[in-house]
Interface confidence: medium
């Protein structure tokens, strides 16, 4: 190989050992039969050399540094050449370094040709191995602006007082152009300006200077974003730290087109703006740090650019001004993430404060909009507390558990609407009366409606789930002893059409001791399947539940148990079942931990089924499934 550097070129070439490898044989640079492991070539020198091994790329790297002095004379602006040409260099991993020194008053602009640059952070690397490292200067201190790959959005970087640019090319890469040019600009009065151009949908992750170390004290850095007019941009902070400020405040400032309050100033911990149309600037401003305990300011953020959906141009009003103790959350539904670019899905308050989820609270009217490629990616969860504090007052009150119609007007699906019903302990109980009789969801007869009511205890220490109930069954009411949560859960978008079928009324009633009482009026056409609360986990210890089963005058009810035995094993106490005829009060008692369950039996009149649990041994829980069928009476037995 021969490398000749012109005298006025200001280029030095250094060939040196790269990262040591565990290769058995060493390799040397051979110059006039002399073996060495380092070769430095200065301007005006011409050197012939070879390598002592077949694969020098495994041993050596080459650095080509060009010093450009803009202090003493004119600056060579324009497209930057790779000198010496890569074809004249040995096939080693190459790093071209351009070190430009300029006055503080002169701005220097690096312009990158397409495919532009993409910044990457610690622990990442470029797929093709081509890397740009860009640094600036503040007085004598070097500041890392960032490390970049190809195929991104960064089109220009403006700095002042000097630039150090390093282009790393792997030995196998055929590239023979630098891919950037340098231009002079007027002073930018800040550390740097990075321009990021979006041609279409996409995202860019960018970082403050020196990231992940601290941003220089009291400095200002700006990012300029060029966004096609038909697209929308949203900013989200992925990672940030604040330093300890003695004077001034660390902040970000936005120049947003059409905003009447430019610049819009945000704290780093604020929700950042979204749904922005057109170009905008974002600036990071540091502060004067505490000398004793400076801390570090750093920021990594993402700009997401995407098409606005039809929905994002609409404002939706959610009127919770008359609601109390209510919160409505719009959030992403859980999905497996694909690896390709997924446009963001944001919900925006007052069109500007956009985030992946949003909670609206009661007592106000809220205006929201959406910035989302597909609104099925979001769902809504609502929680409402209805508490009674004065048992004398509540005892005559009923409340309608209905989903407010405003919620149906939103373009996202309702997932859960939960009412937490709270009563004074040992003073009142609750009764739920549905607008349409309910069916209990069982494996044998699953619900196939677009929604169900999930009824569970709301007492923290109690693990009691009464079950899932949907309209179209035989359960007329559910009485519960104490605090419960009732959750309307939707399973299909058709819930909007079926919404008229929803409707429960809760009333506060005198206190009773049983955990739950189900009032059932079987339908003559079908089996009514009923099962004990906490199915699969077992009825909680010492819990008692009852079913009040009505039998019409002209019908006979057949009560059938699913199993021959319950399988419960009592550690303490007894588990028993009482079946009582309501008319005669005649009752039969079955020991559930000893006796077999009764064979199918016929009831000509309304009857009670009461199940009371013991304290079961672990793994030997009490679960009971039974069903009731009606058949017409053939003989009048009244």
């Amino acid at each position: 190989f021969e490398i000749a550097l012109p005298r006025e070129s200001n280029i030095t070439v250094l060939i040196k050992l790269g990262t040591p490898t565990l290769l058995a044989k060493p390799c040397y640079i051979v110059i006039s039969k002399r073996h060495t492991t380092m070769l430095s070539i200065k301007p005006g020198e011409r050197i012939l050399f070879t390598f002592s091994c077949q694969s020098p790329e495994n041993h050596f790297v080459i650095e080509i540094q060009k010093n450009i002095d803009c202090m003493s004379g004119p600056c060579p602006f324009g497209e930057v050449q790779l000198q010496p040409s890569t074809s004249l260099l040995p096939t080693l991993n190459r790093t071209f370094i351009w070190d430009v020194k300029a006055h503080k008053s002169i701005g220097l602009e690096l312009q990158f040709s397409i495919p532009r640059l993409r910044q990457f952070g610690p622990g990442e690397s470029c797929p093709d191995g081509v890397t740009y490292s860009i640094s600036g200067r503040i007085d004598a201190t070097v500041v890392r602006i960032g490390t970049f790959c190809s195929n991104g959005t960064v089109s220009r970087i403006k700095m002042q007082e000097g630039v150090k640019m390093a282009l790393h090319l792997p030995w196998f890469h055929p590239r023979n152009v630098s891919g950037f040019s340098i231009a002079n600009r007027s002073s930018i009065k800040r550390l740097c300006i990075i321009e990021s151009v979006f041609e279409g949908e996409g995202s860019a992750t960018l970082m403050s200077a020196n990231y992940p170390e601290g941003f220089p004290e009291d400095e200002l850095m700006t990012w300029q974003f060029v966004i096609p007019a038909h697209l929308r941009a949203s900013v989200s902070f992925l990672n940030f730290n604040l330093s300890n400020c003695e004077r001034k405040e660390e902040r970000v400032e936005y120049y947003i087109p059409g905003s009447t309050t430019n610049p819009e100033v945000f704290k780093l911990e604020d929700k950042q703006p979204g749904n922005m149309a057109g170009n905008f600037n974002l600036s990071l401003q540091g502060c004067d740090q505490d000398a004793q305990n400076p801390g570090i300011l750093r920021l990594q953020f993402q700009v997401l650019v995407q098409h606005p959906q039809n929905e994002s141009n609409k404002i939706y009003v959610v009127d919770l001004s008359n609601e109390r103790a209510t919160s409505l959350t719009i959030e992403p539904r859980p999905v497996k993430q694909s690896r390709k670019f997924v446009p963001g899905c944001f919900v925006c308050l007052e069109s500007r404060t956009c985030s992946t989820n949003l909670t609206l609270t009661s007592g106000s009217k809220h205006k929201i909009s959406f910035l989302c490629d597909n609104l099925t990616r979001l769902w809504m969860n609502v929680e409402k507390n209805i508490s009674c504090t004065d048992h004398r007052y509540c005892q005559r009150k009923s409340y309608s558990l209905q989903v407010p119609s405003d919620i149906f007007h939103l373009p996202v699906e309702l997932h859960d609407f939960s009412w937490k019903l709270l009563v004074p302990k040992d003073r009142l109980s609750l009764v739920l009366v549905p607008a349409q009789k309910l069916q209990q969801h069982t494996h044998e007869k699953p619900c196939n409606t677009s929604f169900s009511y999930l009824v569970a205890s709301a007492i923290p220490s109690q693990d009691l789930y009464f079950g899932s109930f949907c309209p179209g069954g035989s359960i007329e009411q559910i009485q519960v002893k104490q605090n419960i949560s009732v959750t309307l859960r939707t399973f299909a978008p058709s819930f909007r059409q079926e919404a008229s079928r929803q409707g429960l009324t809760v009333s506060f009633i005198p206190y009773f001791k049983e955990e739950g009482v189900f009032t059932v009026t079987p339908d003559t056409k079908s089996k009514v399947y009923l099962r004990t609360p906490n199915w699969d986990r077992g009825l909680p210890s010492l819990t008692s539940v009852s079913w009040n089963i009505s039998v019409p005058r002209d019908q006979v009810a057949c009560l059938t148990f699913f199993k021959e035995r319950t399988g419960v094993v009592c550690q303490t106490g007894r588990a028993f079942m009482i079946i009582q005829e309501q008319r005669t009060r005649a009752e039969e008692i079955f020991s559930l931990d000893e006796d077999a369950l009764p064979k199918p039996r016929f009831h000509h009149h309304s009857f009670w089924v009461n199940i009371s649990n013991c304290s079961p041994a672990s793994g030997k829980q009490l679960d009971l499934l039974f069903w009731v069928t009606l058949t017409p009476r053939t003989v009048d037995l009244t």
Epitope: E323, C388, Q402, S405
Partner: antibody
Framework: QEQLVESGGGVVQPGRSLRLSCVTS????????MHWVRQAPGKGLEWVAV????????YYADTVKGRFTISRDNSKNTLYLQMNSLRAEDTGVYYC???????????????????WGQGTTITVSS | DILMTQSPSSLSASVGDRVTITCRAS??????LAWYQQKPGKVPKLLIY???TLQSGVPSRFSGSGSGTDFTLTISSLQPEDVATYFC?????????FGPGTKLEIK
């Protein structure tokens, strides 16, 4: 027995002022929002004003805004309506009414009005 | 402001008839609607709140339904004592406007 008794009505000339009172009993007055509603002779009901249980929020119908002031004295269990710059169209029966749910137990701020007074008549005429 | 309209403005029905009165809000009010009954010469009485919940002491022949903008008050079997004017009222937020009323008479 929950009771509301209005007083202070009478005949008054246009432009003059009048103050209505509503004395309550049989319930914890300080826990309830209170309303004034009026009814012109032979006409429907017109909501006039509401005051929250603690007096912090007050809202008025557009027809009386700036002229009428609703207030309450929880220590006296009494609701007031101060009416200034009276007009002929203010003539009617004025009812005080209790908000349908107390401030603590309710899942909503307003419920409708579940207890009404017998009303007091105002005639604005020259 | 939200406007409340009622229809019909008056109606005449026979004892035992099923009677329906409708109330419409010019904008959605969720289920924040109350129905009142005012008998001649008497004070108004709350019948139904939150669109469908019966006030305690009100006969079960009265029922309410609807949500959003359209609401109905139904008397399943008209009784002589039901002669009155019926008003709807929205209370999602102030002003708490009443409907103009529906006068119900017995044929």
């Amino acid at each position: 027995q929950e009771q509301l008794v209005e007083s202070g009505g009478g005949v008054v000339q246009p432009g003059r002022s009048l103050r209505l009172s509503c004395v309550t009993s049989g319930f914890t007055f300080s826990s309830y929002g209170m309303h004034w509603v009026r009814q012109a002779p032979g006409k429907g009901l017109e909501w006039v004003a509401v005051i929250w249980y603690d007096g912090t929020n007050k809202y008025y119908a557009d027809t009386v805004k700036g002229r009428f002031t609703i207030s309450r004295d929880n220590s006296k269990n009494t609701l007031y309506l101060q009416m200034n710059s009276l007009r002929a169209e203010d003539t009617g029966v004025y009812y005080c009414a209790r908000e349908g749910c107390d401030t603590i137990s309710c899942p909503y701020y307003y419920y409708g009005m579940d207890v009404w007074g017998q009303g007091t008549t105002i005639t604005v005429s020259s | 402001d939200i406007l409340m309209t009622q229809s019909p403005s008056s109606l005449s029905a026979s004892v035992g008839d099923r009677v329906t009165i409708t109330c419409r809000a010019s904008q959605g009010i969720n289920y924040y609607l109350a129905w009142y009954q005012q008998k001649p010469g008497k004070v108004p009485k709350l019948l139904i709140y939150t669109a469908s919940t019966l006030q305690s002491g009100v006969p079960s022949r009265f029922s309410g339904s609807g949500s959003g903008t359209d609401f109905t008050l139904t008397i399943s079997s008209l009784q002589p004592e039901d002669v009155a004017t019926y008003f709807c009222q929205k209370y999602n937020s102030a002003p708490f406007t009443f409907g103009p009323g529906t006068k119900l008479e017995i044929k």
